[in-house]
């Protein structure tokens, strides 16, 4: 079952013993069947895995990627999975741990020796066939090493949102990914009705900024529900 796959994973965050807000998220560590954490003047235990559902890699941590944990099982459930280290198999950049990228199906180091010249890509458009990658296309990419030293500005090529400066996210633009501005109040946003639909977007939008959510525009009355305009609105 999905649960048995998940329970082999690392601890996510420990909850506070008696409720209230925890501090910052804990880092992943190896887990025994249960983990002790302080609770008042005694110790309590928490199950050793907290699945974190996601729709896109950016919702996960920088050391994770978003995918279905089992092939063919629990359709529709995607969770954050631990990133893959060098020489492990991959289908896209986000699957590889920071400092690596996906080349010819293998995570390879993105150190300076590997990054010379501009972007070079091989695109295979494949929507829904057996060879399709997790985000709808495969690519071979060579990037300038400088993007790993400074945060990308708007328009810079990126692999993941953590490559971009504050206020920007890494989103698809044609067949590459570039840093784009996080959406502001009133800007049009994309609400994904079905799982995986964002994989078909050629011009992907960022998510809505802090305190905003993507909702149907109140004054936008149209007969078709699917064609209603969504904008970033205050909670």
């Amino acid at each position: 079952t999905l649960n048995s796959v998940l329970n082999s994973n690392a601890i996510k965050n420990l909850p506070p013993p008696l409720g209230g807000a925890a501090g910052h998220p804990g880092s992943a560590v190896s887990a025994a069947p249960g983990i002790l954490y302080p609770g008042g003047n005694k110790y309590q235990t928490i199950d050793n895995y907290q699945p974190y559902p996601c729709a896109e890699d950016e919702e996960c941590g920088t050391d994770e990627y978003c995918a279905s944990p089992t092939r063919g099982g629990d359709a529709g459930v995607q969770i954050c999975l631990a990133c893959r280290k060098r020489r492990k198999r991959c289908m896209r950049h986000a699957m590889c741990c920071p400092g690596n990228y996906c080349k010819n199906g293998i995570c390879v180091s993105s150190d300076q020796n590997h990054f010379r010249g501009e972007i070079e890509e091989t695109i295979t458009e494949s929507f829904g066939n057996d060879h399709s990658t997790l985000d709808g296309y495969s690519r071979r990419t060579t990037l300038s090493s400088k993007m790993y030293h400074t945060k990308g500005q708007e328009g810079s090529v990126c692999l993941r949102s953590s490559d971009c400066a504050s206020g920007l996210c890494c989103a698809r633009h044609f067949w590459s990914k570039i840093c784009k501005p996080v959406l502001k109040e009133g800007q049009v946003c994309t609400k994904h009705r079905r799982k995986g639909s964002h994989g078909l977007e050629i011009f992907q939008r960022c998510y809505c900024g802090e305190g905003l959510s993507c909702r149907i525009q109140k004054d936008h009355h149209q007969a078709s529900n699917s064609s209603r305009l969504h904008t970033c609105q205050r909670h």
């Epitope: 998220p25 559902p53 949102s161 504050s166």
Partner: nanobody, 125 residues
């Protein structure tokens, strides 16, 4: 100060239903995943259900699949847990938890960093 307040718990007969709510207040951050956990006496605290930021990916523990439904309302910063066909083994304290992040913040490992105080659910057989 961030607060998560659960409500909707109580005593119900086996086969009955309850709807838990959890409201997030205070703090200026984006709410990413939201989840419900439970802890029965002498047991580990375990995940019941969780929902992604967009609501398009939902996880359920095997023990509650087909009986419980998680949903969220971002406008109200609220997460719900509809519990149907309740069994005596569902008796526990139910906690809600969320991942709250400042704009542009991305931790190394995503997880639930704000937790409620819990609400008791008791199912009598």
């Amino acid at each position: 100060e961030v607060q998560l307040v659960e409500s909707g718990g109580g005593l119900v007969q086996a086969g009955g239903s309850l709807r838990l709510s959890c409201v997030v207040s205070g703090g200026t951050f984006n709410v990413y995943a939201m989840g419900w956990f439970r802890q029965a006496p002498g047991r580990l605290r375990e995940i019941v259900a969780a929902i992604s930021r967009t609501g398009s990916s939902i996880y359920y523990a095997d023990s509650v699949k087909g009986r419980f439904t998680i949903s969220r309302d971002d406008a109200k910063k609220t997460v719900y847990l509809q519990m149907n066909s309740l069994k005596s083994e569902d008796t526990a304290v139910y906690y809600c938890a969320v991942d709250g992040r400042a704009n542009g913040e991305r931790p190394a490992v995503a997880g639930y960093n704000y937790w409620g105080q819990g609400t008791q659910v008791t199912v009598s057989s």
